[in-house]
């Protein structure tokens, strides 16, 4: 079904996130005693890393366009704090329709 | 088609419990593509959005912060309707309180409202 | 919370007539707004969603625009089952606000 499809898509995604975050890391020399917000995979989306301060933007995960195929995609952002990651905005149920990712059960 | 069917009392006293049921016919308050919400509107606060409940997997709610400390908004999937409490009421909520399904569709939306209820907060 | 403002508060106008009413945002929402009319003593039935989107069922007299913090509903060629009141409601952020409302009467 759908579901068993998007539990192989958010694997795959997972994987080429946190591939993602290591090549970012090493180019922006960032470690883990770095200022800043470290690269991280929310279980929804993959977030790069960021210096004090940026604002980073991603589009809704490609999965809301099985559900959604003919609509544009919506965008989240998040600010790197001195505290680290803030919350999204707007939350992914908002913008995207969908708010955590759903295992068959 | 959808239907959204309000019942509950028209009069509540002051910093007693308001409690309110929208009986869904035509779709299941568990369909993982909607959200069951509430709303009122009133002369001074016109239309306030309070919260919504949903089913993904698991029942979720979200609640509006003015009143986030006094609601809740529960799922019956054995009569597929849910309900709204709120708690400690005064005068000031005093309004006609809606149900209304949620869809999505580039954002959410409210397509199907029940008929409303007129509330009296009131000694 | 988002404010949502509209203009005019209320408007008077014909059978025949193009009307267009105004919805602004406090702050940028992209696209994520809605449309509803509401007759007296009646719910609010949702007429537009996404800021141009129109709704199964609804007259195609009936359109919106606009992106960002400003936004319009337009009825061309008003009817009589169109005088009614108006509200926009943002759907960005939790909780959801909706506009004072536009009421449209008869001149």
């Known amino acids: 079904g759908s579901m068993a499809h998007s539990d192989g898509i958010f694997k795959k995604e997972q994987a080429m996130c946190l591939e993602k975050i290591q090549r970012a890391n090493e180019l922006m020399g960032f470690n883990d005693s770095s200022p800043g917000c470290p690269g991280m995979w929310d279980n929804i989306t993959c977030w790069k890393p960021a210096h004090v301060g940026e604002m980073v933007l991603v589009s809704c995960p490609e999965l809301f366009r099985i559900f959604n195929p003919d609509q544009d995609m919506g965008v989240v952002s998040r600010n790197c704090t001195e505290d680290g990651w803030s919350e999204p905005f707007p939350h992914y149920f908002d913008a995207c329709g969908f708010d955590e990712y759903e295992s068959e059960t | 088609q959808v239907q959204l069917q309000q019942s509950g009392p028209g009069l509540v006293k002051p910093s007693q419990t308001l409690s309110l049921t929208c009986a869904i016919s035509?779709?299941?308050?568990?369909?993982?593509?909607?959200?069951w919400n509430w709303i009122r509107q009133s002369p001074s606060r016109g239309l306030e959005w309070l919260g919504r409940?949903?089913?993904?997997?698991?029942?979720?709610?979200h609640y509006a912060v003015s009143v986030k400390s006094r609601i809740t908004i529960n799922p019956d999937t054995s009569k597929s309707q849910f309900s709204l409490q709120l708690n400690s009421v005064t005068p000031e909520d005093t309004a006609v309180y809606y149900c209304?399904?949620?869809?999505?569709?580039?954002?959410?939306?409210?397509?199907?409202w029940g008929q409303g209820t007129l509330v009296t907060v009131s000694s | 919370d988002i404010q949502m403002t509209q203009s005019p508060s209320s408007l008077s106008a014909s059978v025949g007539d193009r009307i267009t009413i105004t919805c602004r945002a406090s702050?940028?929402?992209?696209?994520?707004l809605n449309w509803y009319q509401q007759k007296p003593g009646k719910a609010p039935k949702l007429l537009i969603y996404?800021?141009?989107m129109l709704q199964s069922g609804i007259p195609s007299r009936f359109s919106g625009s606009g992106s960002g913090t400003d936004f319009t509903l337009t009825i061309n060629s008003l009817q009589p089952e169109d005088f009614a009141t108006y509200f926009c409601?943002?759907?960005?952020?939790?909780?959801?606000?909706f506009g004072p409302g536009t009421k449209v009467d008869i001149k």
């Open positions: 702050q940028y929402i992209v696209r994520y």
């Open positions: 409940t949903y089913y993904r997997g698991k029942w979720k709610n």
């Open positions: 209304a399904r949620g869809m999505w569709n580039q954002n959410w939306f409210l397509d199907h």
């Open positions: 409601q943002q759907a960005i952020n939790q909780p959801y606000t």
């Open positions: 035509g779709d299941s308050v568990s369909n993982k593509q909607a959200t």
């Open positions: 996404a800021a141009n």
